[in-house]
C-alpha cells in the first residue's frame, strides 16, 4: 500500500475524557511528526477522539482492543492493522470530528484505495438504515435528545476528532480493535461478529466530511462520568433531527479547546453527517453546525460549508 506523505495529519490539542472500551472499535496512534503523541480512538458510531496515551484508561482500552482484534483474527475474521498516516478513512459511514480536530486539505498524500467493507453489524449502524447515526441520548433534564455527535459513542463531546466522511481513496489507519458490527471505517476490516442473528444490510448514509468546530459544552449536558440519567421529558422525540454537528461539547469535559488537524483526501460524495446522540446528560439540543465538506475526487481542495442544524429533538417524551 502506498502511504502518502508522512506529514502530521492529525494533531490533538485536547484529549478526551474517559470512554468505555465497550463503545470503542479501533484505535490508532498519530504520527511521530505530530510532535505531541496521541491515540486516536474510534467509537462504534465512528466518531474519533484524541486520547492521552499516558492515561491508564487509554492503555487499558488499547490492550482490550488488541485482545479483541486477536480473538477476531483467530475466529476467522480478518482484521487489518494498518500502520500509516492518519487520514480520514474512506467509508460510507458518517463520522464526526471533534473540535480538537482541524481539517487540512492535503495535496500530496495518496491513500490506499482500500474500500472499507462494512464489517460486522455494529459499524453498520452508523450507517444503518436510519438516516441519523444511531442514538440519542438522555439528559439530566430527562430528555433524550437526538443523537448528537458524541453521545452514542460515549465519547465526550468536545474532544471528538471528526466523523469520517466517505472518501474515494481510503486512508490507512493503524487500528487495533475488532470491528464491531457496522461498516467499518478502517480499511478492509471484516469480521463475523454476531453469529446467530441476521445480517443487517449495510447502507451507508452520506456523511459530511469532518470539520472542526468549537462548541462550548451545552448547558446541562453531561460530562462523562457526570450528568443525570437520561429521562424522557415532554419534548421532542429523539428522532428526526437535523444533522447534528459532528463536534459538540456535550460533555463539559470535552470542552472546546482541542483542535486536531486532519488532512483530508478527496471525498467521493458530499453528504450530511448523520447525527449521533449526545451522551446522556441533559439533552438539550445544542446549536451545532454540521459541516459539509465537498471534495472533488479530482482535486484535493475542500469546501467547508457550515450548515446550521435547525432541528433537535429529545428522545423521550
Amino acid at each position: 500500500q502506498h502511504h502518502g506523505v508522512t506529514k502530521c495529519n492529525i494533531t490533538c490539542s485536547k484529549m478526551t475524557s474517559k470512554i468505555p472500551v465497550a463503545l470503542l472499535i479501533h484505535y490508532q496512534q498519530n504520527q511521530a511528526s505530530c510532535g505531541k503523541r496521541a491515540i486516536i480512538l474510534e467509537t462504534r458510531q465512528h466518531r474519533l477522539f484524541c486520547a492521552d496515551p499516558k492515561e491508564q484508561w487509554v492503555k487499558d482500552a488499547m490492550q482490550h482492543l488488541d485482545r479483541q482484534a486477536a480473538a477476531l483474527t483467530r475466529n476467522g475474521g480478518t482484521f487489518e492493522k494498518q500502520i500509516g498516516e492518519v487520514k480520514p478513512r474512506t467509508t460510507p459511514a458518517a463520522g464526526g470530528m471533534d473540535e480538537s480536530v482541524v481539517l487540512e486539505p492535503e495535496a500530496t498524500g495518496e491513500s490506499s484505495s482500500l474500500e472499507p467493507t462494512p464489517s460486522s453489524q455494529e459499524a453498520q449502524r452508523a450507517l444503518g438504515t436510519s438516516p441519523e447515526l444511531p442514538t440519542g441520548v438522555t439528559g439530566s433534564s430527562g430528555t433524550r435528545l437526538p443523537p448528537t455527535p458524541k453521545a452514542q459513542d460515549g465519547g465526550p463531546v468536545g474532544t471528538e476528532l471528526f466523523r469520517v466522511p466517505p472518501v474515494s481513496t481510503a486512508a490507512t489507519w493503524q487500528s487495533s480493535a475488532p470491528h464491531q458490527p457496522g461498516p467499518s471505517l478502517w480499511a478492509e476490516a471484516k469480521t463475523s461478529e454476531a453469529p446467530s442473528t441476521q445480517d443487517p444490510s449495510t447502507q451507508a448514509s452520506t456523511a459530511s466530511s469532518p470539520a472542526p468546530e468549537e462548541n462550548a459544552p451545552s448547558e446541562g449536558q453531561r460530562v462523562w462520568g457526570q450528568g443525570q440519567s437520561p429521562r424522557p421529558e415532554n419534548s421532542l422525540e429523539r428522532e428526526e433531527m437535523g444533522p447534528v454537528p459532528a463536534h459538540t461539547d456535550a460533555f463539559q469535559d470535552w470542552g472546546p479547546g482541542s483542535m486536531a488537524h486532519v488532512s483530508v483526501v478527496p471525498v467521493s460524495s458530499e453528504g450530511t453527517p448523520s447525527r449521533e446522540p449526545v451522551a446522556s446528560g441533559s439533552w438539550t439540543p445544542k446549536a451545532e453546525e454540521p459541516i459539509h465538506a465537498t471534495m472533488d475526487p479530482q482535486r484535493l481542495g475542500v469546501l467547508i460549508t457550515p450548515v446550521p442544524d435547525a432541528q433537535a429533538a429529545t428522545r423521550r417524551q
Epitope: G136, G154, P277
Partner: antibody, heavy 119, light 107 residues
Framework: QVQLVQSGAEVKKPGASVKVSCKAS????????IHWVKQAPGQGLEWIGW????????KFNERFKGRTTLTADKSTNTAYMLLSSLRSDDTAVYFC????????????WGQGTTVTVSS | DIQMTQSPSSLSASVGDRVTITCRAS??????LAWYQQKPGKAPKLLIY???TLADGVPSRFSGSGSGTQYTLTISSLQPEDFATYFC?????????FGGGTKVEIK
C-alpha cells in the same frame, strides 16, 4: 413517556423455542440500543446482548451465542429475542432495557417476561 | 470477562440506618459502574451511573463512590421504601456484568 412493554409469560418444553417481544414507545426506536438481560429464579442479572434497531446489528455475551437470536422490527418499534433449543436452565425472567448513548447502563426497562421450561 | 463481586449478599437494617454496599471488580472498570434497585416482581431501577451520578428522580440519600476496582453504594438514612435488592453493573467492557446482589431487609 418512554416505555418498553414485553410479551406475556410463556411455558415451553425442553427443545422448543420461544420468542419474547419488547415494544418500545415514547422515543425514536432506531436511535437506541435495546439490551436483553436474564434473571434466573432467585438469581442475579446476566446480560445477554444488545441489538441496534437502526440496522439490526447485534452483539452477544459469548455465553448466549448460538441459541439466541436478536432482531428488531422498525415498522412496529419492536425488538425480539428468540431462544431456541430450550433447556431447564433457560427458565428465568427476561428483561429488555435501553439506555443512553454515553454508556451501556439501563435507564428504562421492560416489565419482564417469565419463561418456564418444563417437561 | 470482568467479574463483579458484591458484598454483603444480604443485610438487615432499620429505618434511619446508614447502609453501605460494596462492589469489587476483577479488573479496573474506570468508574463505569451503575447501581440498580430491584423490588420483588419488578424490573430493576437505575439509581446511579458513572460511579456517582444520581439518575433522575433518585433521592439524594443515595450516593456512590469508588475508583479502579472498588465501588460503594451508600444509603445515608434508610427509608421504608429502600428495602429491596441492589445490584451493581460494570459497563466498561462487554460482556457487561452485574454483581450478585445485596438484599436489604428490615431488622
Amino acid at each position: 413517556q418512554v416505555q418498553l412493554v414485553q410479551s406475556g409469560a410463556e411455558v415451553k418444553k425442553p427443545g422448543a423455542s420461544v420468542k419474547v417481544s419488547c415494544k418500545a414507545s415514547g422515543y425514536t426506536f432506531t436511535n437506541y440500543y435495546i439490551h436483553w438481560v436474564k434473571q434466573a429464579p432467585g438469581q442475579g442479572l446476566e446480560w445477554i446482548g444488545w441489538i441496534y434497531p437502526g440496522d439490526g446489528s447485534p452483539k452477544f455475551n459469548e455465553r448466549f451465542k448460538g441459541r439466541t437470536t436478536l432482531t428488531a422490527d422498525k415498522s412496529t418499534n419492536t425488538a425480539y429475542m428468540l431462544l431456541s433449543s430450550l433447556r431447564s436452565d433457560d427458565t428465568a425472567v427476561y428483561f429488555c432495557a435501553t439506555g443512553p448513548t454515553d454508556g451501556d447502563y439501563f435507564d428504562y426497562w421492560g416489565q419482564g417476561t417469565t419463561v418456564t421450561v418444563s417437561s | 470477562d470482568i467479574q463483579m463481586t458484591q458484598s454483603p449478599s444480604s443485610l438487615s437494617a432499620s429505618v434511619g440506618d446508614r447502609v453501605t454496599i460494596t462492589c469489587r471488580a476483577s479488573g479496573n472498570i474506570h468508574n463505569f459502574l451503575a447501581w440498580y434497585q430491584q423490588k420483588p416482581g419488578k424490573a430493576p431501577k437505575l439509581l446511579i451511573y458513572n460511579e456517582k451520578t444520581l439518575a433522575d428522580g433518585v433521592p439524594s440519600r443515595f450516593s456512590g463512590s469508588g475508583s479502579g476496582t472498588q465501588y460503594t453504594l451508600t444509603i445515608s438514612s434508610l427509608q421504608p421504601e429502600d428495602f429491596a435488592t441492589y445490584f451493581c453493573q460494570q459497563f466498561w467492557s462487554t460482556p457487561y456484568t452485574f454483581g450478585g446482589g445485596t438484599k436489604v431487609e428490615i431488622k
